[in-house]
């Protein structure tokens, strides 16, 4: 689950579960910073606006990131 706060990492738990790119409203990638030493990925789902922290090391999540970036590059002129 994500928690909002000013300091430290946002994600308290992370999921390995694959996410369907079509069900994604938004994918937030937070790079490492002075507050949090690792990348954090927060998916916002279209259904109910539910959020989920994703495991950046998971194969399924890496594939999701590839799919999303491919989709974005198709859209951009």
């Amino acid at each position: 689950i994500p928690l909002s706060r000013t300091v430290r990492c946002t994600c308290i738990s992370i999921s390995n579960q694959p996410v369907n790119p079509r069900s994604l409203e938004k994918l937030e990638i937070i790079p490492p910073s002075q507050f949090c030493p690792h990348v954090e990925i927060i998916a916002t789902m279209k259904k109910k606006g539910e959020k989920r922290c994703l495991n950046p090391e998971s194969k399924a999540i890496k594939n999701l990131l590839k799919a999303v970036s491919k989709e974005r590059s198709k859209r951009s002129p």
Epitope: I1, L3, R5, R8, C11, I12, I14, K48, K51, R52
Partner: antibody, heavy 121, light 109 residues
Amino acid sequence: QVQLVESGGGVVQPGRSLRLSCAASGFTFSNCGMHWVRQAPGKGLEWVALIGYDGINEYYADSVKGRFTISRDNSKNTLYLQMNSLRAEDTAVFYCARDWPEGYYNGMDVWGQGTTVTVSS
Amino acid sequence: EIVLTQSPGTLSLSPGERATLSCRASQSVSSSYLAWYQQKPGQAPRLLIYGASSRATGIPDRFSGSGSGTDFTLTISRLEPEDFAVYYCQQYGSSPPFTFGPGTKVDIK
């Protein structure tokens, strides 16, 4: 199967220390935030502390702040609660619980059976 | 800190009856952040409802949750003998503490 087993409870004198452990099995412990929740005899549930999956984030109830420390060893699939300066009002059953990771907040979906801490002179 | 109030303190009903339990927050709670638990004597709590209205895995459909803002409800449509227990609501706001309500005891009339 998914399981949490607490240990380390017992009878201790006021002002002394105790360390509780919670052994996790059947799931990817290193992906899950973990909580300690306690229940005084005949009373309701009280959230005590939370630690993030990576050990970076720690949160405490005001009643234990500065006295209790939550920690974890992901290589051993174990959660800990170090309790110092114990008081009579800390007497309770202590449960560890898993923070369900498959959503924004899906509650504490797996609980241990609890370990009893009695603070008495 | 958000304070949760549960009512009634005790609910005396017979098997087959409908139970309606209330949980009120001292300030608005996002629906995503409210859960209900059941606890039987000598046992650990069990997650029933998360996100105010979603049933946890394996929870029978006689249990349902509703509400938003400061008022939330747990409904048990037809009480089974195994449903007599204490029920707690819990809020999980954007930062701790993650408070529990004081509980509602559902006992046999």
